[in-house]
């Protein structure tokens, strides 16, 4: 267990031409406020994936009022650390985004309006108990500048947060093979606690004989990398002998969301849905209203200012949640038919269509002859089998070049009878239908199944089709 | 597959004036053979008006100059404008569809059409 730690030193025009406006102005006062989203970077999905390690909202920044013609500066920012505590070990690898908020404080209808300024993303290597890291990111014409770092919380030490330490119990040393617990030197490392045979790389305990494994790592001693091997096994690749790990308990066995929320199971861990005036990774984190600001991604807050009151996010499109912290993943419901290629663009949802199909979901079969040219007079429609024109008379073939019988491509529906006719091909059509082709029947019997000719109707006269 | 959804039926007076809206999904309806049917209760279905891909048209003797069939190919949709209803009219309204592709025949669920005063 420990807290990563963000400490936001500026936000403000980046260097280079076209510096930005200033968020705020005379008429309408504003402050900055900041979250921050940490995600395990092993993960490939962790772009779209919730803040699994974790989310992070800071305090408002003072009020802010630009001076009319001077540049925007360095705008002022909120006091304190942005801290993001983590129960299990850390990650090592982790990606971070860190959003800008700007709250506007003029006299909207319904209190302040949130506004999204900017958003910096990355992915970086950290090994917990090291020195601050530094890092400037630049958002269009933003730039922010920022250091964090993570740090275990006792007794846990390490890099991975995964030792623990006690307090000596002898003045002077440390019990046999046991060493010192750096920084805390009047500390010793604690026996080892964990199941025999836990991997010491890849497995850690918080309690005495457990062995929970680290991300990408799984079995009973954590020592089976999880690989993308196909299982029979509901809880999917590991044992060494098999390639499969007997379904053993999962990550939401005795349900790790506090306060009423749901657990899911995902690929790699499991994700808490929480109520109403919950949220953190396992809903621990309570006593919100919409003055905590507590719908990200441009969601509208509804709610009272008093602690016990709910409040409701409206989440914009392509957000959900209680929050608005996740992202749909639009295209993991496979909007586009016809084997179309699916591009969310966060602001609208876009079908690229395999040839010969079109439409905002590529719902439309079109027929293949746009941009065809049908000889001898033909006409490029769908129907009569494979031609892709609709040739006159006396012609046929793909492109209407061969001289052929027209009645070839069978142009008569529902059994109707086709006569080769000086001005065109004439349909004799079956008892029942009717039409130039004979396409529709008189009285279909059931809307499933037609019949070949509904008994008492005498066959319609031949309809010409010209 | 063809998808059908008829849209537009209710209750009208003797006289008065509907249109039903067909919105056809998966497939161009230019290519399409369409069609209206209606069914009254305890009668068979039978052909109201059709409009081959081509465009050429067709009613019931019952209906024409009252009931115009017409398609709009942007929308993906074909229309029936019902003119001068009269209490005979009564029934629901089918939508059809001919894919000559694969000559096979798609229908919708119905919408009910009622003219009572």
């Known amino acids: 267990a420990g807290v990563f730690e963000l400490q936001i030193h500026s936000f403000g025009p980046g260097p280079g031409p076209g510096a930005p406006r200033s968020p705020c102005s005379a008429r309408l006062p504003c402050r900055l406020f900041f979250r921050v989203c940490l995600k395990p970077g092993l993960s490939e999905e962790a772009a779209e994936s919730p803040c699994a390690l974790g989310a992070a909202l800071s305090a408002r920044g003072p009020v802010y009022t630009e001076q009319p013609g001077a540049p925007a500066p360095d705008l002022p920012l909120p006091d304190g650390l942005l801290q993001v505590p983590f129960r299990d070990a850390w990650p090592g690898t982790f990606s971070f985004i860190i959003e800008t908020w700007r709250e506007e404080l003029g006299d909207q209808i319904g209190g302040p309006a949130w506004s999204l300024l900017a958003r910096v993303a990355g992915r970086r290597r950290l090994a917990a108990g090291g020195p601050w890291a530094r890092d400037i990111q630049r958002a269009g014409a933003w730039e922010l500048r920022f250091s964090y770092r993570a740090r275990c919380e006792p007794p846990a030490v390490g890099t991975a947060c995964t030792r623990l330490c006690r307090p000596r119990s002898a003045p002077s040393r440390c019990g046999p093979g046991l060493r010192p617990c750096a920084p805390l030197e009047d500390e010793c490392e604690a026996p080892l606690v964990c199941r025999a045979g836990c991997s010491p790389e890849h497995g850690f305990c918080e309690q005495p004989g457990e062995c929970r494994c680290l991300e990408g790592w799984t079995g009973p001693l954590c020592t089976v990398p999880v690989s993308t091997s196909s299982c029979l096994s509901p809880r999917g690749p590991s044992s060494a002998t098999t390639g499969c790990l007997v379904p053993g308990p999962g990550p939401c066995d005795g349900n790790p969301c506090a306060n009423g929320g749901s657990c899911s199971e995902t690929p790699r861990s499991f994700e808490c849905t929480c109520p109403r005036g919950f949220y953190g990774l396992r809903c621990e984190v309570s006593g919100v209203t919409c003055a905590d600001g507590p719908c990200f991604n441009g969601g509208l807050c509804v709610g009272g200012a008093d602690p016990d009151s709910a409040y409701i996010c409206h989440c914009p499109p392509g957000f959900q949640g209680s929050n608005c912290e996740k992202r749909v993943d639009r295209c993991s419901l496979q909007p586009c038919r016809n084997g179309g290629l699916c591009l969310d663009l966060g602001h609208a949802l876009r079908c690229r269509c395999r040839a010969g199909f079109a439409g905002p979901r590529c719902e439309h079969d079109l027929d293949d002859c746009a941009g065809r040219a049908c000889a001898n007079g033909g006409t490029c429609v769908e129907g009569g089998g494979a031609h892709r024109c609709s040739c006159a008379l006396g012609f046929g073939g793909r492109d209407c070049r061969e001289r052929a019988d027209p009645c070839a491509a069978r142009p008569c529906a529902h059994g109707g009878r086709c006569y080769a006719h000086f001005s065109g091909l004439v349909c004799a059509c079956a008892p029942g239908y009717m039409g130039a082709r004979c396409e529709f029947p008189v009285h279909p019997d059931g809307a499933s199944a037609l019949p070949a000719a509904p008994p008492g109707l005498r066959p319609g006269d031949p309809q010409r089709y010209l | 597959e063809v998808q059908l959804v008829e849209s537009g039926g209710g209750l009208v007076q003797p006289g008065g004036s509907l249109t039903l809206s067909c919105a056809a999904s998966?497939?161009?309806?230019?290519?399409?053979?369409m069609a209206w049917y209606r069914q009254a209760p305890g009668k068979k279905r039978e052909l109201v008006a059709g409009i081959s891909n081509e465009g050429s048209t067709y009613y019931m003797d019952s209906v024409k100059g009252r009931f115009t069939i017409s398609r709009d190919n942007a929308k993906n949709s074909v229309y029936l404008q019902m003119n001068s209803l009269r209490a005979e009219d009564t029934a629901v309204y089918y939508c059809y569809a001919y894919k000559w592709r694969s000559r096979s025949t798609y229908w919708g669920q119905g919408t009910l059409v009622t003219v009572s005063s």
């Open positions: 998966m497939y161009s309806v230019s290519f399409l053979s």
